[in-house]
């Protein structure tokens, strides 16, 4: 079936970083500069991407695949493959309209993006406050505060933080 | 293709005004949130200013509030930024970019950006 492919579709052998070219009588031609096919058996090259403006250049362009790019210091990737680039905050801010601003009280940002979110509520674990929160950084729960009672035979370690959130883009 | 190109940049004393310019092609302008962002000599970029779709909504770094005014004319592809009462720290190199739609991508997410036109204040 394969050659059968092939003696009807000449431009079936032609391999990825190359294309079919019409004008040659479908010879296989190389990717001209600044293009590139990732597949075998096109009869066009696709336009490589340009990483200008914000974006850096992450990988070149090479005749088999598209350029990479990502964000110049002070933003980070936004969507597929870094179709945008949106500016970082510093830790315990929250990008706005208006800018980078800071966490209002009682929530918190611990890294450069996404959203303020709440600190956690020790006391819906049973649990009370071992290390109040900031702008950068999620309350520390502690034992309850019955476990913290005279006469109380141990004491439970602090539970971890919970995990960072991530903001929906 | 899609392109912004600014200009409008120049020398002024402190105290002067400059009215920058940036126009868009290649696309559907009026769909865009649209920004100004600045580059002062051996500093990171900052955020200088956006506006929405229709020009209701405009947001400036604390630095410039009061002194810069963004506005657009989508009849035109343009938009513009009134620099007054300009200050030493105002010397940069600024450059427009294009924000989100608001719906498809985030507001503050750019993708397209102008070649910059420098800004020196100084007397």
């Known amino acids: 079936f394969e050659r059968t492919r092939s003696l009807q579709d000449p431009c079936s052998n032609c391999p990825a970083g190359t294309f079919c070219d019409n004008n040659r009588n479908q010879i296989c031609s190389p990717c001209p500069p600044n293009s590139f096919s990732s597949a075998g058996g096109q009869r066009t090259c696709d336009i490589c991407r340009q990483c200008k403006g914000v974006f850096r250049t992450r990988k070149e362009c090479s005749s088999t695949s598209n350029a990479e790019c990502d964000c110049t210091p002070g933003f980070h990737c936004l969507g597929a493959g870094c179709s945008m680039c949106e500016q970082d905050c510093k830790q315990g801010q929250e990008l706005t309209k208006k800018g980078c601003k800071d966490c209002c009280f009682g929530t918190f940002n611990d890294q450069k993006r996404g959203i303020c979110r709440p600190w956690t509520n020790c006391s819906l674990d049973g649990k009370s406050v071992l290390v109040n929160g900031t702008k950068e950084r999620d309350v520390v729960c502690g034992p309850s505060p019955a476990d913290l009672s005279p006469g109380a035979s141990s004491v439970t370690p602090p539970a971890p933080a919970r995990e960072p959130g991530h903001s929906p883009q | 293709e899609v392109q912004l190109v600014e200009s409008g940049g120049g020398l002024v004393q402190p105290g002067g005004s400059l009215r920058l310019s940036c126009v868009a092609s290649?696309?559907?302008?009026?769909?865009?949130?649209m920004m100004w962002f600045r580059q002062a000599p051996g500093k990171g970029l900052e955020w200088v200013a956006n506006i929405n779709q229709d020009g209701s909504e405009k947001y400036f770094v604390d630095s410039v509030e009061g002194r810069f005014t963004i506005s657009r004319d989508n009849a035109k592809n343009s938009l513009y930024l009134q620099m007054n009462s300009l200050r030493a720290e105002d010397t940069a190199v600024y450059y427009c970019?294009?924000?989100?739609?608001?719906?498809?991508?985030?507001?503050?997410?750019?993708?397209?950006w102008g070649q910059g036109t420098t800004v020196t204040v100084s007397s």
């Open positions: 290649g696309f559907t302008f009026s769909n865009y949130w």
């Open positions: 970019a294009r924000g989100g739609d608001g719906y498809s991508s985030s507001h503050y997410g750019t993708d397209v």
